[in-house]
């Protein structure tokens, strides 16, 4: 999906009002310096591409983020404020239902959510030059 036509300001507002708090809640008890940010993005569409990937695509050691409140809010934000987003996703994932597993917060998930926090912060500051 091409995120170029999203309403970035509405997504930013959703992040600032709710998603950011849910990410902080998830990371509670973790030092902010514990993980190095290794994933970056260069502009808002690119940031949303990376956020989508990190939030919804299962990775080795962390398969459970879709059940988290920040993930559901991200999913709905993209569906509402990115024209055509939900249409592309309905067909792509209709046959991928999996049996629910017990929710476990692993260190790998904490690292992944730390990366997400960095991507969201970058999304909110699109005019900053890449470090």
């Amino acid at each position: 999906y091409d995120f170029t036509n999203c309403d970035f300001e509405k997504i930013k507002a959703a992040y600032l009002s709710t998603i950011s708090k849910d990410l902080i809640t998830y990371m509670s008890g973790t030092k902010s310096t514990e993980f190095n940010n290794t994933v970056s993005c260069s502009n808002r569409p690119h940031c949303l591409t990376e956020i989508q990937s990190l939030t919804f695509n299962p990775t080795a050691g962390c398969a459970s983020l879709a059940k988290e409140m920040f993930a559901m809010k991200t999913k709905a934000a993209l569906a509402i404020w990115c024209p055509g987003y939900s249409e592309t996703q309905i067909n792509a994932t209709q046959a991928m239902k999996k049996r629910r597993k017990r929710k476990v917060t692993t260190n790998k998930c904490l690292e992944q959510v730390s990366q997400l926090q960095g991507l969201w912060r970058r999304f909110n500051r699109p005019l900053l030059k890449q470090q």
Epitope: T18, P58, A66, M69, M72, A79, A92, T93
Partner: nanobody, 120 residues
């Protein structure tokens, strides 16, 4: 799997009101989002509103200030109060519920849809 049944659609005059209901049955989980999509003839399906288990809500610009989403957790039901309806609100309205059990970006459960027609 959660089953969703919508009701409340119908024919209404411009400026009128309707309240859609979406009753969920089946498994229930702590974190969830319930929302409403709509699809007008010949147009893409669009999400117009969402409500989360923590009470926060989202609205599309096209309905903000006119539509109100709410949920009654004791009844496992979500509502969409639609006021100041316009002809362009005419569409099939679909309820969705999600608790993160799908691997990917779509929503777990979809209702069959209820038709809303705004016409004089």
């Amino acid at each position: 799997e959660v089953q969703l049944v919508e009701s409340g659609g119908g024919l209404v005059q411009p400026g009128g009101s309707l309240r859609l209901s979406c009753a969920a049955s089946g498994n229930s989980f702590n974190n969830y989002v319930m929302g409403w999509f709509r699809q007008a003839p010949g147009k893409e399906r669009e999400m117009v509103s969402a409500i989360f288990s923590d009470g926060s809500t989202y609205y599309a610009d096209s309905v903000k200030g006119r539509f109100t989403i709410s949920a009654d957790n004791s009844k496992n039901t979500a509502y969409l109060q639609m006021n100041s309806l316009k002809p362009e609100d005419t569409a099939v309205y679909y309820c969705v519920r999600d608790s993160g059990s799908v691997s990917g970006q779509t929503f777990d459960s979809w209702g069959q849809g209820t038709l809303v027609t705004v016409s004089s």
